[in-house]
Interface confidence: medium
């Protein structure tokens, strides 16, 4: 007879994978505020993909396509994102991008459990947005429906690097613009993010189609059934986003509290015997004040667990409003 605890464990993940811990991981998911946020991500992505992909349609048809108007496409993508961020930022954080969501997970601004719902909503929104565009566009001009493709003279590796770079600059812009620790940020944060998207397009449309957003590439790929080099539009942006988020949050502008805990942990670790590990308790938010809020000044963040307003952090140590 074994002395196993009553709570069943899965695989080799030991004490982490108890039923209780799984439910704790999904704490805050089953609330009205959270589902509003997920729905907002879905709707924002649907509108963004529908509007922005519409600008890529070549009305010259298949016989003699019109020259690609890079400025038109770049502005449409940039302004669409800016508008959606302005509309939905206070509801869901206005990620509208799985790469941004992953970066938020890596910088502990949103839980993995919640990010799963966000990414699913974003992908579904992108598919439906691309689907609507396909339905309303004449077959004679549908073309590739804005499917992102690597330039014929470039390798997948080049494409991956370009996507990494442009997503890096986008996510760095997001983190820097929404940093509540800054007092020098003026003007529209949504526009700053939109311009960052536009700049990425102006540079990279000819290279890779300038995705910077895995869901934006996923939607038309599903509708058109074109999966050529699709993986780079997930791998590149996610790596770029995580690098940008990590560098900003932990290297360039780390939080005072984080620095204190890091030093604490580091000094304790040095005192430990070789080969042993220590457990650092962390049940607090990374920041003490509002973090990554869309509007400058005092802004209230929705507590998705209790469906009420409060400043700064919630019980699970996440900040939802983060673009």
């Amino acid at each position: 007879m074994s002395d196993r605890p009553t709570a069943r464990r899965w695989g080799k993940c030991g004490p982490l994978c108890t039923r209780e811990n799984i439910m704790v991981a999904f704490k805050g998911v089953w609330t009205q505020a959270f589902w509003k946020a997920v729905t907002a991500e879905f709707l924002a992505m649907l509108i963004f993909v529908l509007l922005s992909l519409g600008s890529t349609i070549n009305w010259g048809g298949t016989e003699k396509p019109l020259p690609v108007d890079m400025v038109l496409i770049s502005l449409c993508f940039g302004l669409s994102i800016a508008t959606m961020v302005q509309c939905f930022g206070h509801i869901s954080g206005g990620h509208i991008n799985p790469a941004v969501t992953v970066a938020m997970v890596c910088t502990r601004k949103i839980s993995i459990a919640k990010s799963v719902f966000y990414i699913a909503a974003q992908c579904l929104g992108a598919i439906i947005g691309a689907g609507i565009l396909y339905l309303v566009t004449p077959p004679s001009v549908v073309g590739g429906l804005g499917v992102t493709m690597v330039h014929g003279n470039l390798t997948a590796g080049h494409g991956l690097l370009v996507e990494l770079i442009i997503t890096f600059q986008l996510v760095f812009t997001i983190f820097a613009s929404c940093d509540s620790k800054r007092t020098d940020v003026t003007g529209s944060i949504a526009l700053a993010i939109g311009f960052s998207v536009a700049i990425g397009h102006l540079f990279a449309i000819n290279y890779t189609g300038a995705s910077m957003n895995p869901a934006r590439s996923f939607g038309p790929a599903v509708i058109m059934g074109n999966w050529e080099n699709h993986w780079i539009y997930w791998v590149g942006p996610i790596i770029g986003a995580v690098l940008a988020g990590g560098l900003y949050e932990y290297v360039f502008c780390p939080d005072v509290e984080f620095k204190r805990r890091f030093k604490e942990a580091f000094s304790k670790a040095a005192q430990q015997t070789k080969g042993s590990y220590m457990e650092v308790e962390d049940n607090r938010s990374q920041v003490e004040t509002d973090d990554l809020i869309l509007k400058p000044g005092v802004v209230h963040v929705i507590d998705v667990d209790r469906g009420e307003e409060k400043k700064g952090k919630d019980q699970s140590g996440e900040v939802l409003s983060s673009v």
Partner: antibody, heavy 126, light 110 residues
Framework: QITLKESGPTLVKPTQTLTLTCTFS??????????VGWIRQPPGKALEWLAL???????RYSPSLKSRLTITKDTSKNQVVLTMTNMDPVDTATYYC??????????????????WGQGTMVTVSS | QSVLTQPPSVSAAPGQKVTISCSGS????????LSWYQQLPGKAPKLLIY???KRPSGIPDRFSGSKSGTSATLGITGLQTGDEADYYC???????????FGGGTKLTVL
Amino acid sequence: QITLKESGPTLVKPTQTLTLTCTFSGFSLSTSGVGVGWIRQPPGKALEWLALIYWDDDKRYSPSLKSRLTITKDTSKNQVVLTMTNMDPVDTATYYCAHRSLSSYSSNGKDAFDIWGQGTMVTVSS
Amino acid sequence: QSVLTQPPSVSAAPGQKVTISCSGSSSNIGSNYLSWYQQLPGKAPKLLIYENNKRPSGIPDRFSGSKSGTSATLGITGLQTGDEADYYCGTWDSSLSGVVFGGGTKLTVL
């Protein structure tokens, strides 16, 4: 008023090269959205598209005849020239040139061959 | 063998209505505008219908065009003896990157 007229030899020997000229008026082949194409019709048979040249010197050819065809334009002379190598008796046909306009580049474009020349009959025989 | 398929011949009495079909594939009719041409005996072809259903100036409204999916139809009402001609459908083919025509339909007015 747009007009086109084909000119060239009426009799060509097998293996020889056919050179046809289309002289047009009423439009310029430097205007965006405009093209000139060549179509042939063997006696008692259907129309067969051969080649097409656009205002920007972009050229398209029938896949089955691509290796034998060359289309060029002389904008200053308002002429389009089609050359067809290695002529064969099966190439006996009436050859037409036609004006093509694209709706996406021009408000009065039709995405069709809207004006045709009268045609020139070419016989390939030894 | 033409890329677009048309019936070889159709016939009807004067004053009657006749339709001529043209079928293709997703790369031609399915994704591009279709045009119809009329070729009177011994004459050059003339554009009859463009962009699926539009008539050039000078073409009477007895002639109409429609398109659905990968097939198209030319309709002629109030048939006249002067309508006796060969009718061709034509369109761009995205796969071939060129113009394609149907095999032609001979219209006989009885």
